[in-house]
């Protein structure tokens, strides 16, 4: 399976050498170092830090280590001029202002630098008007308001709570709904699990608490100024107006225990079903506007926030490939953080670390990759995912045509329960291989692989004793690497048990009180989870980059490709009427899956027998391999969203954290009852489907045999 | 530690009126709510009302409405309540008790009780 | 206003054996958001109350296990499984899902 040349380690322990050198101590001791202090995206601390994280990678022996810089925009507040939400009574007082900043965590009371909560890239401006309570802001809560209440957001100020769908995709739709601001709470309901106390005594989030984060619809883009080209010294930069994915309207997250003052007044109609409920006490009321006693008070936002052109660095690291230098694998994960970062990113850094000092300790010992290993500690994720995709658009031709894989390393853990994956179907093979020989770190799991404790506790919904694997979204820096260029990407970490807690993400995500702390006392102690994650991450790396024939197995695409065609026919089919009208057809597409499907057996076939020892031919099917994921490329992109351009899968245009199939079908689909022009929007269906099937019969010759 | 710390004992005369003091520490003050509670022989625990210390928001017992007043000062983290025409059946202690908030709604800090004598 | 109705009044118990005092609502005590915010207080001799129970069933921090709340609706117990001598005072029943807030008459436990 892995192959020995250029090493003098022999081929069943090059990849046993690799994660016994992982260690969990190493793990910890980097975690704290990386989280002593705030690295945020365009600050000195976050250059010092990929300053030490380029010294360090070279001491652990890789063969080069770089720094790529760009002039991105970001987004600050104003020190002296400080972000808040107020309630004003008729004469325009304010009677109530939220808090500026979170009160610190035991320990860091004196840290400086501390940004206080805010919404980045919101506009300034210091709307006032009546509240109105939108559920998570989700494209149906607004059809619920809009149709079923006839409740007019139009003008007014809205909450929503966070959770369900990116925050970006909240605003974009409040934008929409024509509010004018939006206040972003998190809801203990989403973001405290019963049972457990708030920090410092435990994992929950104080009401105090308040997750920051960036409210772009960037849709692919990266920096906004320069969307598709990097941004370098020779930039040409898009006037503020012409930037891409800013919000037009002022934004700003608050804790619970702010949001309590503003939800307990709220009079207007009543929520419409429990669902609309969280588990502040308060009636949860939809508004518009305040209740009897208060209803000639209003809310009014203070928003100072400045857009700046910020110097950003990546640290590149290169590890040269023996036999196939001109092929890439590349690690990725990114170093700046809204805070501490205590797990994101750093829990994420802290293991993307410790694999490169495992392989820099087996190319001093004189072994090598077959292919060329690229680590990254990427910047400004946080800001929309820039620096990974300033350096991608930088280096685009040569990872379009070099690119074999991109694993991504953001936080290791956001859970302690079980192990979760999203990856291309390429890579379920590898993924399951690779579990069943690590040893499971699960309780009651001993001498049990991590194949075992996984199926176990997240189980596949389709396949019976396999685990769950799920589609990549975005939200994090593969995205530029999957949904624009088409290489093939995977990313795992340990996860909640989603059965038993059912809040958004972590509760203390993205706030001040994410501190090496939180990890070491109440996430994992022993950083066993971490040393699996490290596992599974350097695991799948090793194999991409070592082995003789790609690990990707096209077989696995043709099935998720037929249970993708079946979801997206049985939504059209929720309209028969119309698909008979207008003589909409899914045979084109059913008829490219079935092709794929026997090509893709055929060529797993002549991967079995074919002459390995025969350099030209293997080159070539690992070409085929590595070229599958590019195949479901369309140069022209999705409609209105040009830099997402996989075929298969997009962030869903409702919630960017969340992967959609067939999403050009699954868009022209949407909603589409309501459209004005029916014949115009079927005529978009048919296209989306023959654009969908043209694609996957494409990908499907890529596969057979070349001549 | 949160801390609730109340004036000391008041004797009045009937029809006279008493404010109360209640000083709050190891906590944000504007974040909790500050109820009052007094406690008879005759009547047991009585809710009086509350006050956010945020926006100075009160709520009253029907009960004493009229009588009570509940204010608040932000800048020494304080809350006072005033009951005048004071009655004979106004004796009691006194007690000031922090609003738990989420995830409690409940009253977990009460203050060490002020006793107020009503007698000609 | 809701009225808090508790029995008995007075609970002698024996040390070490379990003690349970009841708490009836004259309504519903059941929020809009699902939770019922009823609560327990003791009060032990010549101090304040403190809050044992919130919630009808959770433990306020560093109330020994040997308490517990159970109930819903209208009906809820409190239920001591050992009874140990600092155990002894007043224990109210309290509600505050509506305005105004009300508590209970008081149960007295005492040692006998």
């Known amino acids: 399976k892995s192959s020995n040349e250029a090493t003098n380690i022999t081929p069943k322990h090059n990849m046993k050498a690799f994660l016994d050198e992982l260690k969990a101590e190493n793990i910890k001791k980097f975690l704290y170092n990386f989280t002593q202090i705030p690295h945020l995206a365009g600050t000195e601390q976050n250059f010092q830090l990929a300053k030490q994280i380029q010294s360090q990678w070279k001491e652990f022996g890789l063969d080069s280590v770089e720094l790529a810089h760009y002039d991105v925009l970001l987004s600050y507040p104003n020190k002296t001029h400080p972000n808040y939400i107020s309630i004003i009574n008729e004469d325009g007082n304010e009677i109530f202002n939220t808090s500026l900043f979170e009160p610190p965590p035991p320990g860091y009371e004196n840290v400086s630098d501390i940004v206080p909560p805010f919404s980045a890239f919101s506009p300034q401006g210091m709307p006032e008007g009546d509240l109105v309570y939108v559920n998570y802001a989700r494209t149906e809560d607004f059809f619920k308001l809009e149709r079923d209440m006839k409740i007019n957001c139009s003008g007014k100020i809205v909450i929503a709570r966070y959770g369900k769908v990116f925050r970006g995709n909240k605003v974009k739709n409040a934008q929409l709904a024509g509010a004018k601001g939006v206040i972003l709470y998190s809801d203990p309901a989403d973001y405290f699990a019963p049972g457990v106390k708030s920090y410092p005594d435990g994992w929950n989030l104080p009401g105090g608490g308040v997750q920051r984060g960036n409210i772009l619809n960037l849709n692919g883009a990266g920096d906004p100024l320069t969307p598709g080209y990097p941004a370098n010294e020779y930039a040409y930069r898009r006037g503020i107006a012409e930037a891409v994915g800013l919000p037009s309207i002022p934004v700003h997250p608050i804790g619970y225990y702010d949001a309590q003052k503003l939800l307990e007044k709220m009079g207007g109609s009543a929520p419409p079903d429990s669902s609309w409920r969280g588990s502040l006490k308060v009636p949860y009321n939809v508004g518009p506007g305040f209740t009897g006693n208060f209803s000639t008070q209003k809310v009014k936002m203070h928003i100072h926030s400045t857009n700046e052109v910020t110097r950003i660095y990546n640290v590149i690291g290169t590890l040269r490939g023996a036999v196939e230098p001109d092929r890439y694998v590349i690690l990725g994960g990114h170093r700046d953080s809204w805070v501490f970062g205590g797990i994101d990113p750093q829990s994420g850094a802290a293991v993307v670390h410790e694999i490169v000092r495992s392989f820099g300790t087996l190319k001093k010992e004189g072994w090598r990759p077959r292919r060329t290993i690229l680590f990254a500690s990427w910047d400004a994720e946080e800001f929309g995912l820039l620096g990974s995709t300033e350096w991608a658009e930088e280096n685009s031709r040569l990872l379009q045509e070099r690119g074999v894989a991109y694993i991504n390393a953001d936080s290791s853990i956001e859970g302690n329960y079980t192990l979760r994956v999203d990856c291309t179907p390429l890579m379920y093979s590898l993924v399951h291989n690779l579990t069943k020989e690590l040893k499971s770190p699960d309780e009651g799991f001993e001498g049990k692989s991590l194949y075992e404790s996984w199926t176990k506790k997240s189980p596949s919904p389709e396949f019976s004793g396999m685990p769950r694997i799920s589609k990549l979204g975005s939200g994090n820096d593969f995205e530029v690497f999957f949904q624009r260029l088409g290489i093939a990407s995977g990313r795992a970490r340990y996860t909640k048990n989603w059965e038993t807690n059912k809040f958004s993400g972590y509760p203390l995500y993205h706030s001040v009180y994410e501190t090496y702390e939180l990890v070491e006392k109440f996430y994992d102690p022993m950083f066993k989870y971490h040393l699996t994650v490290a596992q599974v991450r350097g695991g799948m790396v090793f194999e991409l980059a070592n082995s003789i024939v790609l690990p990707f197995d096209c077989r696995d695409y043709a099935v998720v490709l037929r249970k993708y065609a079946d979801k997206i026919y049985s939504i059209s089919m929720k309209h028969p009427q119309e698909m008979k009208t207008y003589s909409v057809s899914f045979d084109s597409l059913f008829s490219a899956v079935k092709n794929f499907t026997e090509i893709a057996s055929k060529f797993s076939e002549r991967l079995q027998d074919f002459d390995k020892s025969n350099p030209i031919v293997l080159r070539m099917m690992n070409d085929q391999l590595m070229f599958l994921e590019r195949a479901f490329i369309d140069p022209l992109g999705l409609p209105d969203r040009p830099f997402y351009r996989h075929v298969i899968y997009a962030p869903s245009s409702h919630n960017k954290y969340a992967g959609e199939s067939f999403p050009g079908i699954y868009d022209a689909l949407f909603d589409i009852e309501s459209k004005v022009d029916p014949s115009k929007a079927w005529g978009e269906v048919k296209r989306q489907i023959y654009v969908a099937a043209f694609t996957v019969q494409a990908a499907a010759e890529t596969l057979s045999e070349v001549a | 530690q949160v801390q609730l710390v109340q004036s000391g004992a008041e004797v009045k005369k009937p029809g006279a009126s008493v404010k109360l003091s209640c000083k709050a520490s190891?906590?944000?003050?504007?974040?909790?709510?500050i109820n009052w509670v007094r406690q008879t022989p005759e009547q047991g625990l009585e809710w009086m009302g509350g006050i956010s210390p945020g926006d100075g928001n009160t709520n009253y017992n029907e009960n004493f409405k009229g009588r009570v007043t509940m204010t608040r000062d932000t800048s020494s983290s304080t809350a006072y309540m005033e009951l005048s025409r004071l009655r004979s059946d106004d004796t009691a202690v006194y007690y000031c008790?922090?609003?738990?908030?989420?995830?409690?709604?409940?009253?977990?800090?009460w203050g060490q009780g002020t006793t107020v004598t009503v007698s000609s | 206003d809701v009225v808090m109705t508790q029995s008995p009044l007075s609970l002698p118990v024996t040390l070490g054996e379990p003690a349970s005092i009841s708490c009836r609502s004259s309504?519903?005590?059941?929020?809009?958001?699902?939770?019922?915010?009823l609560h327990w207080y003791q009060q032990k001799p010549g101090q304040s109350p403190r809050l044992l129970i919130y919630k009808v069933s959770n433990r306020f921090s560093g109330v020994p296990d040997r308490f517990s709340g159970s109930g819903s609706g209208t009906d809820f117990t409190l239920k001591i499984s050992r009874v140990e001598a600092e155990d002894v005072g007043v224990y109210f029943c309290?509600?505050?899902?509506?305005?105004?807030?009300?508590f209970g008459q008081g149960t007295k436990l005492e040692i006998k």
């Open positions: 309504q519903s005590l059941v929020y809009s958001n699902g939770n019922t915010y």
């Open positions: 309290s509600q505050s899902t509506h305005v105004p807030y009300t």
């Open positions: 190891g906590y944000t003050f504007t974040y909790f709510d």
């Open positions: 008790a922090r609003d738990g908030n989420f995830p409690y709604y409940a009253m977990d800090s």
